[in-house]
């Protein structure tokens, strides 16, 4: 759920106006406090449905609940990509869709949700206990992934409710971006409150700003998502894996990550890996990916409308860097 709060406009301090300064000193902490409390993490939900008509046909729907711009969605099966999973599709808002059999009809449903139909026969077909994972790369939140599978007792035609599955991963872009700002804000807030204790109460003066204040947008986790935090993470079952998959190792990375210092960049790769920690059998987990967006102001590669990461239209090959990123 998105919460919107009206916040008084903050003016630059004017010398000699202790009262006004005091007023602003009081307002700023509350703004920061509101952000600290209400800024919930983004979420990814995954819904897996087996079609009643064809037992080998699945529909996977995934969505991203967050305020950022989606730049790339990766759908995999058999577990998260880079932790034994195999890429089924990648979707970019502008550059289009790429899908690997048995994926069919990957498409955008909205600007923040996608669907994918899987059709297969024999070795390449999915089965009821397959785990499907969706990873959303967005700016500024970073990369977030959740997995889901059909409940064991699912009848064909039924589907698991859309689980805002536990957020599995956040990369450094998100953590250093949003979280960093919030952390700084919270620390600053504590500093201000501490200072405020040792000062006389300031005289309140009317703010000289227009009545129409800017709106500060913050995200609060929904009830559904809070409940989801208690849902155990589905055990990845490898008995129904793509026949063509050898053991996957977390190496490589998408070629659209721009050049970064080696210690700070991990390029996820096409149908390749997104680094992750081992997956526990039960319980949710969060792992931090060693990946940063090339430039903080830029949105990632392909997915939501109007996004691009490389300044060079040739994309991946434009800039060769320390990690082979163009």
């Amino acid at each position: 759920m998105r919460t919107e709060a009206q916040v008084p406009a903050l003016q630059p301090p004017e010398p000699g106006l202790e009262g006004a300064m005091g007023h602003r000193t009081l307002v700023l902490p509350w703004v920061l406090l509101t952000l600290c409390v209400t800024a919930g993490t983004p979420e990814v939900w995954v819904q897996v449905r087996m079609e009643a008509t064809e037992l080998s046909s699945f529909t996977i729907r995934c969505g991203f609940l967050g305020s950022g711009s989606i730049s790339l969605v990766t759908v995999s099966w058999g577990g998260p990509n880079g932790a034994g999973g195999t890429t089924l599709a990648v979707l970019h808002p502008e550059r289009g869709i790429r899908q690997w059999a048995p994926a069919r009809q990957a498409r955008w449903e909205t600007q923040s949700s996608i669907s994918l139909i899987l059709e297969g026969s024999g070795a390449s077909s999915p089965c009821a206990n397959t785990t499907f994972c969706c990873k959303f790369a967005s700016f500024p939140e970073g990369s977030w992934e959740a997995c889901g599978s059909l409940p064991p007792s699912s009848d064909p035609g039924l589907s698991a409710p859309p689980t805002p599955a536990p957020i599995l991963r956040a990369d450094l872009a998100g953590i250093l971006g949003v979280s960093g700002v919030l952390l700084f804000g919270c620390v600053y807030l504590l500093h201000l409150l501490r200072r405020h204790k040792h000062r006389p109460a300031p005289r309140l003066q009317p703010s000289r700003t227009s009545p129409q204040a800017p709106r500060a947008r913050a995200w609060a986790p929904s009830q559904a998502s809070q409940a989801a935090l208690h849902v155990p993470y589905a055990t990845i079952n490898t008995s129904c894996r793509p026949a063509t998959l050898d053991t996957a190792h977390p190496h490589g990375g998408p070629s659209w990550w721009a050049s970064l210092p080696t210690h700070a960049a991990h390029r996820p790769q096409g149908p390749a890996a997104w680094a992750s920690t081992p997956i526990p059998a039960r319980g949710s987990f969060v792992s931090v990916e060693n990946g940063l967006y090339a430039q903080a102001g830029e949105r990632p590669p392909h997915t939501g409308p109007g996004l691009t990461l490389f300044p060079d239209p040739r994309g991946p090959r434009a800039m060769e860097g320390p990690l082979g990123v163009r």
């Epitope: 990509n81 880079g82 195999t86 890429t87 990648v90 970019h92 550059r95 289009g96 869709i97 790429r98 899908q99 690997w100 059999a101 994926a103 069919r104 063509t244 998959l245 050898d246 053991t247 996957a248 190792h249 977390p250 190496h251 490589g252 990375g253 998408p254 070629s255 659209w256 390029r267 790769q269 096409g270 149908p271 390749a272 890996a273 590669p301 392909h302 040739r314 994309g315 991946p316 090959r317 060769e320 990690l323 082979g324 990123v325």
Partner: antibody
Amino acid sequence: QVQLQQSGAELARPGASVKLSCKASGYTFTNYGISWVKQRTGQGLEWIGEIYPGTINIYYSERFKGKATLTADKSSSTAYMQLTSLTSEDSAVYFCARDDGYYDAMDYWGQGTSVTVSS
Amino acid sequence: DIQMTQSPSSLSASLGQKVILTCRASQDIGSSLNWLQQEPDGTIKRLIYATSSLDSGVPKRFSGSRSGSDYSLTISSLESEDFVVYYCLQYTSSPWTFGGGTKLEIK
């Protein structure tokens, strides 16, 4: 600069196997995939499959499952394709091509390896 | 599988002439289409990627465009080295598929 160097021509007996190689240079091997493509004499191009050495994700065209096996050696930046149970239908030139798995598909190509199956 | 129907299969043209080669996709492939050039010695080179983007080092006389499910490669003024074989490639849905090729011959 990016280069894909393929192994030399092969002459094999029916029923035998051959293993073709594609050595990559000029880029980070694990950041891209290698696709393999078949071209019979005077005919068009046909995709066999691809391997992503960074994750060992492997994909095959249905037509080539059981015929081709793709592997990669990260230490030597080399991709391999083994063709088994060879018949005259497998006589062709086989190309490898680089692919990023996103939107830079088959941007660089090897020079091709000719395979002739004859008794 | 997505079928790519390329036409014409062969084309005779003169130096300096403008030619247009086309590929039709049996399903929606968005902009995920490349044009490749194959020399007589077998060497394959990508000319155009993502429907209309020119690869580096490729002469500006080559251009790509799309109209619905029809994709075109235009050579604005033929030069002697252009008389080779051209293929289109879709890479939106595996198996990736190629057009049957167009052999460009000098008239």
